[in-house]
Structure formats: structure tokens, C-alpha cells
Interface confidence: low
Amino acid sequence: MVPEEEPQDREKGLWWFQLKVWSMAVVSILLLSVCFTVSSVVPHNFMYSKTVKRLSKLREYQQYHPSLTCVMEGKDIEDWSCCPTPWTSFQSSCYFISTGMQSWTKSQKNCSVMGADLVVINTREEQDFIIQNLKRNSSYFLGLSDPGGRRHWQWVDQTPYNENVTFWHSGEPNNLDERCAIINFRSSEEWGWNDIHCHVPQKSICKMKKIYI
């Protein structure tokens, strides 16, 4: 049992709390006035507008991502690049491995809700980075599909499909009815792409551009 406070103890506690709140308010006002004084002496308009822009940008992204992990880009203290926590970053993009099993369409919707798309792989280096975060006994949807079943593959972000930068498993793609692409592991040839039925649920990889603030 927690003993009930005596009325005077409660009043004393309340008085202390009020004192703390007021002292914090006074300190805040003092700090603000110092800031205003400094800003009137030194022209900090640029820094101020940059901060305002940052805050509005962060607010804009908060609807998708309540938490961002940011790193300083280069030596300039002004430029920060961010990825949603706990996404991983590579070059100018952020990646998220979705472990829920969904159809290709639902997977793409799931990514778009987070302000992203199913992954578009542009280089061997990018694929090598991505596979570090994948499980060998799982398959993951890519943002690559052939909606008409005519072997006209297209990326979700309209990046041109370049036959020279594809990583299909040998013998793939091999079925006109299989109109969506996954990346998976085959013991004979490691990681590669395979065409599959779009409705068969798989895990997926989302990709979005880094947020620069």
C-alpha cells in the first residue's frame, strides 16, 4: 500500500512543482532574449530561415516517419541527410526490408504508405548492399513488373529497364504468366532475380530517396 500524502505535503509538493515550472519559464525567456539580442547584433537571417525550413521539412515527413536518423553530409554543418529509423542507407537512398508476406500490389501499396516504392536496383553495388540485409531462405519483391505479359519489364519509378543492368537467375525470366520479379538465393548461383506470379505473397524491399534537411 502507498501511504496517502498529508494535505500540507501535497501543497508543498505542488508549490515546488509550480516553482520549477516558473523557473524553467524564466530561464527559457532569458535564453530567448539572449538569442534575439545576438541575432540583432549579428545577421543570422540565413541560419534562422534554414532552421525554419528544416522544421517545416521535418514536420512534412513526420506523417510518414515519426523518427529519423540523420548524418552530416560532408564537412558542411548545414547539410544533413536522413533516413527513417530503422531503415538502412546506401548512397542517396534509404531501404526497408518488409517481412510481412503480401502480394506484389499490396507490397507496393505498403511501401507507398511509407513514402517509398518497391526497390529499383540500378547497379551491382546497390544489389550487393541490399543482399547483406536479406535472408537466404526468403524471397523479396522488387519494383519490377511486366503487366502485359509481353516481356516489357518496367520499374515502378519509370526508370528505363536496361537489359545490361539486370541480375536474373540463369533461365529467368521464363514464364509469361509470371509478371512480377523477386530477388532470392539459389545455392548454385547465389542471389538473383526470378519472375513469379504477382499474387503469391512474398516479403519485399522498399526504397526511398534520402531526406535532406
Epitope: M101, K135, N137, S139, N174, D177, H197, V200, Q202
Partner: nanobody
Framework: QVQLQESGGGLVQAGDSLRLSCAPS????????IGWFRQAPGKEREKVAC????????YYEDSVKGRFTISSDTAKNTIHLQMNSLKPDDTAVYYC???????????????WGQGTQVTVSS
């Protein structure tokens, strides 16, 4: 929506046989691995047998080896699970599901059907 449909379950005596069938709606089995799973009340879903459609290789869980046989009927686009010498321990809901390799974890198989109940009485 692509889904698999199981059939052939029922109530049998210990030592009897049953043949379960798994048929897809919306796609063909070519190139997929099809697994048979079972889930007894209060237990986790376990993989009992699987067939890799790409190479025809089959896999069995230790407790069913020699009693269960998984096979593919290409003409009918159906996967069968022949269960012989059934035991009360085999009582469960049996499901089939699709993946790319038989060694995938149950969570990585998709297109689960509703399941078919198999009850083995002693």
C-alpha cells in the same frame, strides 16, 4: 487472389491411410516448392513434407519418413500427400502452401489454404 485448396481429410483409425490433395486457383505449380504443413491444437505449425517442382526433389520431416509420400500430378496441376500407417499423433489440421525452395521457413511460404482436418483415433 491466388490460393491453394486442400481436400481429403477425415476421421480414420490408427494404422489406416488417407490421401490429401492440394490444388491451386489462379496459378500453376511450375517452378514452385509446395509444402504440406500441419498444426495440432496448442502446437506450432510444422512442415511435414515438401516437393521442389523445379527438380522434383522431396523432403520429409523425420516423424513421417517412410509413412508419408508427397507427389505431383502435373496433368491435374495437383499435389498429393499419401499418408499411410497413421498414428493418433498425426491428428492435426493439414495445410499446403507455396514457396521457392523447400528449405524456406513456414513463415516464408504463401498462399495458404483453409486446411483440412485429419483425425486419427486409437
Amino acid at each position: 487472389q491466388v490460393q491453394l485448396q486442400e481436400s481429403g481429410g477425415g476421421l480414420v483409425q490408427a494404422g489406416d491411410s488417407l490421401r490429401l490433395s492440394c490444388a491451386p486457383s489462379g496459378f500453376t505449380f511450375d517452378g514452385y516448392a509446395i509444402g504440406w504443413f500441419r498444426q495440432a491444437p496448442g502446437k506450432e505449425r510444422e512442415k511435414v513434407a515438401c516437393i521442389n517442382k523445379s527438380d522434383g526433389l522431396t523432403y520429409y520431416e523425420d516423424s513421417v519418413k517412410g509413412r508419408f509420400t508427397i507427389s505431383s500430378d502435373t496433368a491435374k496441376n495437383t499435389i498429393h500427400l499419401q499418408m499411410n500407417s497413421l498414428k493418433p499423433d498425426d491428428t492435426a489440421v493439414y495445410y499446403c502452401a507455396a514457396a521457392w525452395e523447400c528449405d524456406y521457413a513456414p513463415a516464408d511460404f504463401g498462399s495458404w489454404g483453409q486446411g483440412t482436418q485429419v483425425t486419427v483415433s486409437s
